[in-house]
């Protein structure tokens, strides 16, 4: 879902709040990707984005082992990476970034969370000299309230994204449970 000819510019980080007093241990566990917005995300109505899940596991060195599970090509696909604590609690960078060809920077910022229900996380990366950003709306369950979805839409729009760059992935029966 990557339409990269004219990318919407990434917002200044001053427009992206940071969750105060971030509790890394409470953020652990499975999060469903209930909402997804970004400059390389495009809503496709005929074949909608399917929901995936991301599991955060805290390691002894306080970095996260991050595993996403997706349904792809009729099977479950696992994508594993490490998020290393950044300058302030709730900020992370990508571990072992040199092993990702073309990737020169990667920032993760937890915008807001109540840990047991929902979270919004901002991602920004530079790949092949192009700057990409996305925001995920995480839920501990596959469904979140309309109020949370509307807040996610408002926040995404405040970062310059139009509605066709904001999607709510469809919850599916395969891979993401269990």
């Amino acid at each position: 879902q990557d339409s990269t000819s004219d990318l919407i510019p990434a917002p200044p980080l001053s427009k992206v709040p940071l969750q105060q007093n971030f509790q890394d241990n409470q953020f652990q566990g499975k999060w469903y990707v209930v909402g997804l917005a970004g400059n390389a995300i495009l809503r496709e109505d005929k074949d909608p984005q399917k929901m995936y899940a991301t599991i955060y596991e805290l390691k002894e060195d306080k970095s996260y082992n991050v595993t996403s599970v997706l349904f792809r090509k009729k099977k479950c696909d696992y994508w594993i990476r490490t998020f290393v604590p950044g300058c302030q609690p709730g900020e992370f960078t990508l571990g072992n970034i040199k092993s990702y060809p073309g990737l020169t920077s990667y920032l993760v910022r937890v915008v807001s969370t109540n840990y047991n229900q929902h979270a919004m996380v901002f991602f920004k990366k530079v790949s092949q000299n192009r700057e990409y950003f996305k925001i995920t709306l995480y839920g501990r369950t596959k469904e979140l309230t309309s109020e949370l979805k509307e807040n996610f839409i408002r926040f995404s729009k405040s970062l310059g994204l139009p509605e066709n760059h904001i999607v709510f992935p469809v919850p599916i029966d395969q891979c993401i449970d269990g």
Partner: antibody
Framework: VQLQESGPDLVAPSQSLSITCTVS????????VHWVRQPPGKGLEWLIV???????TSNSALKSRLSISKDNSKSQVFLKVNSLQSDDTAIYYC???????????WGQGTSVTVSS | DIVMTQTPATLSVTPGDSVSLSCRAS??????LHWYQQRSHESPRLLIK???QSISGIPSRFSGSGSGTDFTLTINSVETEDFGMYFC?????????FGAGTKLELK
């Protein structure tokens, strides 16, 4: 674009129902197919959708009793409903997925009665 | 699940009348609301998507409005072929749910 359901008229309680939806004018590898039912004289109830990539989304209230599969080459989608009771008596429709999670083309429906 | 409530249950009209059908959601669904027509012994037909967006091939006398929890389908100058059931459907939250319908009948 056409969709056609086929299945039994009568099923005994506690038995299983199998219905086939045969489509033409579009490819199941490009479009999702929904199943919706309508009890006699009542409204519509959404059951399940088979997406083009083979993933499914189902109504959690019925999830344990529903199964769905498809054969892209034969342009057919198969719905199975287990442990039928009298309140499963309905017209069962298949419908093509359209943007914004609507259904733009519907089959004519197949009427199923659950009775001994 | 989101509950969709349609009013009135039955609407008796004369051809040429203009009518409004109401659909209310149990919580905000933004504009994720769609309308279908079902004539007697026929399959449902999509009339309006996303509260107010028209569908190709549907006569312009059908229009939709609303957002949040309250929605309206308006039929300007009802024709005899318009009689039947009208259902609203939400797609803001899974499972997809329909209203119980409004029956448009001849007075």
């Amino acid at each position: 674009v056409q969709l056609q359901e086929s299945g039994p008229d009568l099923v005994a309680p506690s038995q299983s129902l199998s219905i086939t939806c045969t489509v033409s004018g579009f490819s199941l590898s490009s479009y999702g197919v929904h199943w919706v039912r309508q009890p006699p004289g009542k409204g519509l109830e959404w059951l399940i959708v088979m997406w083009s990539d083979g993933s499914t989304t189902s109504n959690s209230a019925l999830k344990s009793r529903l199964s769905i599969s498809k054969d892209n080459s034969k342009s057919q989608v198969f719905l199975k409903v287990n442990s039928l009771q009298s309140d499963d008596t309905a017209i069962y429709y298949c419908a093509r997925h359209y943007g914004y999670f609507t259904m733009d083309y519907w089959g004519q429906g197949t009427s199923v009665t659950v009775s001994s | 699940d989101i509950v969709m409530t349609q009013t009135p249950a039955t609407l008796s009209v004369t051809p040429g009348d203009s009518v409004s059908l109401s659909c209310r959601a149990s919580q905000s669904i933004i504009t994720d609301l769609h309308w279908y027509q079902q004539r007697s012994h026929e399959s449902p037909r999509l009339l309006i998507k996303s509260a107010s967006q028209s569908i190709s091939g549907i006569p312009s006398r059908f229009s939709g409005s609303g957002s949040g929890t309250d929605f309206t389908l308006t039929i300007n100058s009802v024709e005899t072929e318009d009689f039947g059931m009208y259902f609203c459907q939400q797609s803001n939250s899974w499972p997809l749910t329909f209203g119980a319908g409004t029956k448009l009948e001849l007075k």
